[in-house]
C-alpha cells in the first residue's frame, strides 16, 4: 500500500524520495509521474532528471533537496484538490527491470478557515515560481505577474518553511530510500 502524505489547499506538498548515488554527482535518472508507477518509465510525467540535472519539468513541480546527493523528493507548489492522488517516484537504475519504484499517496485537505491575519508577506505573489536550493534560472512567461531579480539561495529557506512540517517527520522511515552501488 502507498505511504500517505497530506497537505492543505494553497500549501506546498512534499513527497519524499531518496537514493544513495554510488558517488556524489554520479546520478541515476529519476522520473516523477502522476498515477501509480507503470511497468516502465512514469505515466503523466511531471518532472524528470538525467545524469546531470532536471531536463523535463512542469511549472509547479520542483526538486528542493540536493538531488546530486540523492534527495529527489518532490515539492508541489500551491496545491489544489486536483493534486490529490498517487504519485510515482522511479529511480531508473541501469539494467533490465532494475528500477526502484515508490508510490506515494497525496491527500489534499481543504484549507482551514481562519480569521483574516495581520498583513504578511505573500510568498507566491512576490515569487510566483517555486524556489529551490539550486538555481533554475529566470521566470518563464507562463507565470503571471512580474518577478523581481531574485537570489534563490537567499530565499530557499523561505520555501522550506512553507512545507507542511508534519510531512517532514520521519522521512527516511517512509521506505522511499534505496542505496545504489
Amino acid at each position: 500500500s502507498e505511504v500517505e502524505y497530506r497537505a492543505e489547499v494553497g500549501q506546498n506538498a512534499y513527497l519524499p524520495c531518496f537514493y544513495t548515488p554510488a558517488a556524489p554527482g554520479n546520478l541515476v535518472p529519476v522520473c516523477w509521474g502522476k498515477g501509480a508507477c507503470p511497468v516502465f518509465e512514469c505515466g503523466n510525467v511531471v518532472l524528470r532528471t538525467d545524469e546531470r540535472d532536471v531536463n523535463y519539468w512542469t511549472s509547479r513541480y520542483w526538486l528542493n533537496g540536493d538531488f546530486r546527493k540523492g534527495d529527489v523528493s518532490l515539492t508541489i507548489e500551491n496545491v489544489t484538490l486536483a493534486d490529490s492522488g498517487i504519485y510515482c517516484c522511479r529511480i531508473q537504475i541501469p539494467g533490465i527491470m532494475n528500477d526502484e519504484k515508490f508510490n506515494l499517496k497525496l491527500v489534499i485537505k481543504p484549507a482551514k478557515v481562519t480569521p483574516a491575519p495581520t498583513r504578511q508577506r505573500d510568498f507566491t505573489a512576490a515569487f510566483p515560481r517555486m524556489l529551490t536550493t539550486r538555481g533554475h534560472g529566470p521566470a518563464e512567461t507562463q507565470t503571471l505577474g512580474s518577478l523581481p531579480d531574485i537570489n534563490l539561495t537567499q530565499i530557499s529557506t523561505l520555501a522550506n518553511e512553507l512545507r507542511d512540517s508534519r510531512l517532514a517527520n520521519d522521512l527516511r522511515d517512509s521506505g522511499a530510500t534505496i542505496r545504489i552501488g
Epitope: 554527482g25 524528470r48 546531470r52 540535472d53 532536471v54 531536463n55 523535463y56 519539468w57 512542469t58 511549472s59 546530486r68 536550493t133 539550486r134 538555481g135 533554475h136 534560472g137 529566470p138 518563464e140 512567461t141 507562463q142 531579480d149 531574485i150 537570489n151 534563490l152 539561495t153 537567499q154
Partner: antibody, heavy 118, light 106 residues
Framework: QVQLQESGPGLVKPSQTLSLTCTVS?????????WNWIRQPPGKGLEWMGY???????SYNPSLKSRITISRDTSKNQFSLKLSSVTAADTAVYYC???????????WGQGTTVTVSS | DIQMTQSPSSLSASVGDRVTITCKAS??????VAWYQQKPGKAPKSLIY???YRYSGVPSRFSGSGSGTDFTLTISSLQPEDFATYYC????????FGGGTKVEIK
C-alpha cells in the same frame, strides 16, 4: 547525438528585425530541456538572450525583453529568434544551445555571424 | 542582475603548468556556476557544472570548486589543447557570464 544548427541572414539593416532559426536533430524539442539563444559580440563575452522550454514557455533577458521573441515550430523541430529594432550593437555571433531547467548549456550550435549595417 | 567578475583577463603559461582562474559573483549564487572553454571561431564547450561537477568527456585535469560568491577553475597540468578562453556562468538568477580569461602560450 544532439546537433543544433543556426541559420538566417548574415546582414541586417539598422532598425529592422533580426530573424534566426535553430534546427535541432537527434532530439525532439518537446521532449525536454530549454532551448536557448546566446550571443557574442566581436571580441567580447557571452550574453544569454532567452529560451523557449520543451513546454513552450519562454524566458528572456530583462535587458532585451522589449525587443525579443523566441518561438518554435515543433513540426520542423526548430526554434527561432526575432530581435526587433536592431542597431550596430546587435552585431554578434549568435548561438543556439540546449540547456537544463537550471540554465547551463551542454550542447551548442556552431554559431552564425550577424552584422547590423546599412 | 548578477555580475560575474573573472580574473585574470589573460594569462601566459607553459605546458605542464598549473593554472587557476577565479570568478567572483556580485551576490550569493550557491553552487549554481558553470565553466566553459572556447577556442577561436568555435562555440563554447561545457567543462564544469554546479561549481564542481565535470561534464562528460572532460579530462580530469580540469576541476572546479567554490560556492557562494567565489569560484575557481583549475587546470592541474596544462596541455597544448588547453590554450583557449574560459568563461564562468552563474544560473542562480537569469544566466550571466564572466568576461573571460584567455590562456596563452608563454
Amino acid at each position: 547525438q544532439v546537433q543544433l544548427q543556426e541559420s538566417g541572414p548574415g546582414l541586417v539593416k539598422p532598425s529592422q528585425t533580426l530573424s534566426l532559426t535553430c534546427t535541432v536533430s537527434g532530439y525532439s524539442i518537446t521532449s525536454g530541456f530549454a532551448w536557448n539563444w546566446i550571443r557574442q559580440p566581436p571580441g567580447k563575452g557571452l550574453e544569454w538572450m532567452g529560451y523557449i522550454s520543451h513546454s513552450g514557455s519562454t524566458s528572456y533577458n530583462p535587458s532585451l525583453k522589449s525587443r525579443i521573441t523566441i518561438s518554435r515550430d515543433t513540426s520542423k523541430n526548430q526554434f527561432s529568434l526575432k530581435l526587433s529594432s536592431v542597431t550596430a550593437a546587435d552585431t554578434a555571433v549568435y548561438y543556439c544551445a540546449r540547456g537544463y531547467r537550471s540554465p547551463w548549456f551542454a550542447y551548442w550550435g556552431q554559431g552564425t555571424t550577424v552584422t547590423v549595417s546599412s | 542582475d548578477i555580475q560575474m567578475t573573472q580574473s585574470p583577463s589573460s594569462l601566459s603559461a607553459s605546458v605542464g603548468d598549473r593554472v587557476t582562474i577565479t570568478c567572483k559573483a556580485s551576490q550569493n549564487v550557491g553552487a549554481n556556476v558553470a565553466w566553459y572553454q572556447q577556442k577561436p571561431g568555435k562555440a563554447p564547450k561545457s567543462l564544469i557544472y554546479s561549481a564542481s561537477y565535470r561534464y562528460s568527456g572532460v579530462p580530469s585535469r580540469f576541476s572546479g570548486s567554490g560556492s557562494g560568491t567565489d569560484f575557481t577553475l583549475t587546470i592541474s597540468s596544462l596541455q597544448p589543447e588547453d590554450f583557449a578562453t574560459y568563461y564562468c556562468q552563474q544560473y542562480n538568477s537569469y544566466p550571466t557570464f564572466g568576461g573571460g580569461t584567455k590562456v596563452e602560450i608563454k
